[in-house]
């Protein structure tokens, strides 16, 4: 791994080993300034592989929202604009960090959390088992 | 907004406001534990808008590793196997907390952050602005 | 007003062929998703097989090779051709409409029954 | 293959709320239906796409799907609410569909 020199400014803490509970603020940094949200918002209606958006909500999370996709179809929009069901939309999914309150219920105290939520869909080809 | 009562258990703090210092535990608890993760895993090779995966290290950023996607061609994989340009392979893009060392190099201090990442591609009809 | 109806079950030696019928009415069977699901005596549901309004058919494992859905447009008829059957195979065999999705089956024939036994 | 995992029974007083869970990996990634099958009748679809009540169901059936697991809730449940029910999903690994094993609710 990379070793980093310690900073002398850190704040005090018992780290015997990696530590179990640190000091998190929550005041979020943004690095996504620059980026134009409307750029993927219509993705999951002009993809071949279209979605819906559903809002899955939890008080005891942060962030309380979040939004997991579902495939629109079982098969693809072709050129025609039909489905094609030899091809098969599939969710996009990825594992993200979320903080969980913990004991439930605390404004301040908070475990780390890894959560998979699907994205987005995208259209493949299907895996057909042949029987011999 | 839903009003929880707060737990009486609660480590002590001064949260006047929504606590912009909280205590995390970084024992991370894994909600995807019946989940397998080969299923999804060849989906960068099986879609029509198939991506590759890049490795984003940061060891101020926890997590530290990111995976990156990025679409492979500019259009789509047709039946034949064949680039079509007449469609778009565009990454779906999310954006996700981390936590980033705050002050830098501290093993115990941390401060929330967003950031923006491709998750993978689909295939999307282009926008043709016509000319009058 | 959408109706199934199924027929073609009955008593077959194990190894033997039978084919399943299922007429529809009050749709068109050829611009719809249309499937076979089974129920052994006493057991719960079983999806065997489906043909999606584009033509393309999948089948559950457990007959994949042996049984075939088909459909007649002129008869506005389901077919399942069964062959090599076994005992494991006695059920009732309804007939299902998907819905527009594919998700989801929301038209149910009555059933037919169909016993495998020596 | 994709398996889905309900509770053999349920028991609940009229005009209580019953729930039926079905559970399976991811399957809030999925959209969830629900099946009413009452003794020597074929099935009838009572929820679609998780949370969908088809024209005729009563109100009082609703659904949710979630993380792992997907719910049928029964509020002010009726004595003719009285069957089997099963969950079913379609795998899109598999290009299959998926039933649960069904659940017996019986109304005390």
């Known amino acids: 791994g990379i070793t980093i020199p310690r900073n002398p400014g850190c704040p005090n803490s018992e780290d015997k080993n990696f530590p179990r509970t640190v000091m998190v603020n929550l005041n979020i940094h943004n690095r996504n300034t620059n980026t134009n949200p409307k750029r993927s918002s219509d993705y999951y209606n002009r993809s071949t592989s279209p979605w819906n958006l559903h809002r899955n909500e939890d008080p005891e999370r942060y962030p309380s929202v979040i939004w997991e996709a579902k495939c629109r179809h079982l098969g693809c929009i072709n050129a025609d604009g039909n489905v094609d069901y030899h091809m098969n939309s599939v969710p996009i999914q990825q594992e993200i960090l979320v903080l969980r309150r913990e004991p439930p219920h605390c404004p301040n105290s908070f475990r780390l959390e890894k959560i998979l939520v699907s994205v987005g869909c995208t259209c493949v080809t299907p895996i057909v088992h042949h029987v011999a | 907004g839903i009003t929880i009562p707060r737990n009486p258990g609660c480590p002590n703090s001064e949260d006047k406001n929504f606590p912009r210092t909280v205590m995390v535990n970084l024992n991370i608890h894994n909600r995807n534990t019946n989940t397998n993760p080969k299923r999804s895993s060849d989906y960068y090779n099986r879609s029509t808008s198939p991506w590759n995966l890049h490795r984003n290290e940061d060891p101020e950023r926890y997590p530290s590793v990111i995976w990156e996607a990025k679409c492979r061609h500019l259009g789509c994989i047709n039946a034949d196997g064949n680039v079509d340009y007449h469609m778009n392979s565009v990454p779906i893009q999310q954006e996700i907390l981390v936590l980033r060392r705050e002050p830098p190099h501290c093993p115990n201090s941390f401060r929330l952050e967003k950031i923006l990442v491709s998750v993978g591609c689909t295939c999307v009809t282009p926008i043709v602005h016509h000319v009058a | 007003q959408v109706t199934l109806k199924e027929s073609g079950g009955g008593l077959i030696q194990p190894g033997g062929s039978l084919r399943l019928s299922c007429a529809a009415s009050g749709f068109t069977v050829s611009s719809n998703h249309m499937s076979w699901v089974r129920q052994a005596p006493g057991k719960g549901l079983e999806w065997v097989s489906i043909i999606y309004s584009d033509g393309t058919t999948y089948y559950a494992d457990s007959v994949k090779g042996r049984f075939t859905i088909s459909r007649d447009n002129s008869k506005n008829t389901l077919y399942l051709q069964m062959n090599s059957l076994r005992a494991e195979d006695t059920a009732v065999y309804y007939c299902?409409?998907?819905?527009?999705?594919?998700?989801?089956?929301?038209?149910w024939g009555q059933g037919t029954l169909v016993t495998v036994s020596s | 293959s994709y398996e889905l995992t309900q509770p053999p029974s349920v028991s609940v007083s009229p005009g209580q709320t019953a729930s039926i869970t079905c559970s399976g990996d991811d399957l809030g990634s999925k959209y969830a239906s629900w099946y009413q099958q009452k003794p020597g009748q074929s099935p009838v679809l009572v929820i679609y796409q998780d949370d969908q009540r088809p024209s005729g169901i009563p109100e009082r059936f609703s659904g949710s799907n979630s993380g792992n697991t997907a719910t049928l809730t029964i509020s002010g449940t009726q004595a003719m609410d009285e069957a089997d029910y099963y969950c079913q999903t379609w795998d899109y690994w598999t290009s299959k569909y998926v039933f649960g094993p069904g659940t017996k609710l019986t109304v005390l």
């Open positions: 299902a409409r998907g819905r527009n999705s594919g998700f989801s089956f929301d038209y």
